[in-house]
Interface confidence: low
């Protein structure tokens, strides 16, 4: 399955929107920084494309879920958030189209299941952190910066997949 060129453009737009969403200075929130343990090894180059697509899909789905909550709506600019949802939704569609085309439809490798679970646990840690910090502006700013970091890493993986085609 060939991810369309518009998919990588959408990824870049998503990062730009995340950057624009910043409301306060991360530097005023240094004490709130947290290591969420992004499972980077699950996004390594050892993956076959069939294994990677569902992991990327899970990553984007979890970002969508995180920013679709009532607490998120209260934290961010509504217009930017709507644009952000649209970009994520389009990327999910692109990845789902790949799955439907047969990529990863065959017996799911255990490694892929483990990777999806690792991504879910990563987002559980983020959600728990937000709850513990009572969804404070600094907590959301720390999470926004973290999602920028992890999303850019997964974007790099998508680009490396394209270049291997």
């Amino acid at each position: 399955c060939d991810l369309p060129q518009t998919h990588s453009l959408g990824s870049r737009r998503t990062l730009m929107l995340l950057a624009q969403m910043r409301r306060i200075s991360l530097f005023s929130c240094l004490k709130d920084r947290h290591d969420f343990g992004f499972p980077q090894e699950e996004f390594g180059n050892q993956f076959q494309k069939a294994e990677t697509i569902p992991v990327l899909h899970e990553m984007i789905q979890q970002i969508f879920n995180l920013f679709s909550t009532k607490d998120s709506s209260a934290a961010w600019d509504e217009t930017l958030l709507d644009k952000f949802y649209t970009e994520l939704y389009q990327q999910l569609n692109d990845l789902e189209a790949c799955v439907i085309q047969g990529v990863g439809v065959t017996e799911t490798p255990l490694m892929k299941e483990d990777s999806i679970l690792a991504v879910r646990k990563y987002f559980q840690r983020i959600t728990l952190y937000l709850k513990e910090k009572k969804y404070s502006p600094c907590a959301w700013e720390v999470v926004r910066a973290e999602i920028m970091r992890s999303f850019s890493l997964s974007t790099n993986l998508q680009e490396s997949l394209r270049s291997k085609e």
């Epitope: 200075s25 920084r33 970091r149």
Partner: antibody, heavy 118, light 107 residues
């Protein structure tokens, strides 16, 4: 493409001030912080502080507190770093750098050599 | 302030060699560690951010590892264009601090 273009070399006397500019282009200026880092001849890199291009907020290293001022002009997408009460040990190349997020810099200016000599 | 200590301060190597540079922080900095390459008369160039993430456009022979206080930059097979000075930088807390640098020159 992203570019940070700095002003030219300066020679100053001890006790004077210097103002270095950094003009940004190729990205949305207000979305990113600009940091300043200096490097004395043959020495390592030293972080000076940051400027929030959006709000104009700043943060300076304790070492430079009271001597450094960072400002910006959003109409020209330019950030300025002014260092006062110059001494010979301020002789260095001064770099501006665009912060991606969480403190790493993907683009740097070409550097401005400031020489402090009597 | 967090002190960053790089070792070695200089090393001589040949093209094709595997090169390892270490960086130690005076306190835990999680994964807020970045690596830069600098050539004479030029601005630093970002290689690795967040301890192990390869910056876009940087050759895959560069890799970073570590978390907490101990970090490593590895060049798997040194190329002629890799002879330069390498700096680690912590971005865990301000003031952000750099290691003193490791100069890699030709043996």
């Amino acid at each position: 493409q992203v570019q940070l273009v700095q002003s030219g070399a300066e020679v100053k006397k001890p006790g004077a001030s210097v103002k270095v500019s950094c003009k940004a282009s190729g990205y949305t200026f207000s979305n990113y912080y600009i940091h300043w880092v200096r490097q004395a001849p043959g020495q390592g890199l030293e972080w000076m502080g940051w400027m929030d291009s959006n709000s104009g907020g700043t943060g300076y290293a304790q070492k430079f507190q009271g001597r450094v001022t960072m400002t910006r002009d959003t109409s020209t997408s330019t950030v300025y770093m002014e260092l006062s009460s110059l001494r010979s040990e301020d002789t260095a190349v001064y770099y501006c750098a665009k912060e991606v997020f969480s403190g790493w810099y993907d683009y740097w200016g070409q550097g401005t050599l400031v020489t402090v000599s009597s | 302030d967090i002190q960053m200590t790089q070792s070695p301060s200089s090393l001589s190597a040949s093209v094709g060699d595997r090169v390892t540079i270490t960086c130690r922080a005076s306190q835990s900095i999680s994964s807020y560690l970045n690596w830069y390459q600098q050539k004479p008369g030029k601005a630093p160039k970002l290689l690795i951010y967040a301890a192990s993430s390869l910056e876009s456009g940087v050759p895959s022979r560069f890799s970073g590892s570590g978390s907490g206080t101990d970090f490593t930059l590895t060049i798997s097979s040194l190329q002629p264009e890799d002879f330069a000075t390498y700096y680690c930088q912590q971005s865990y807390s301000t003031p952000y601090t750099f290691g003193q640098g490791t100069k890699v020159d030709i043996k």
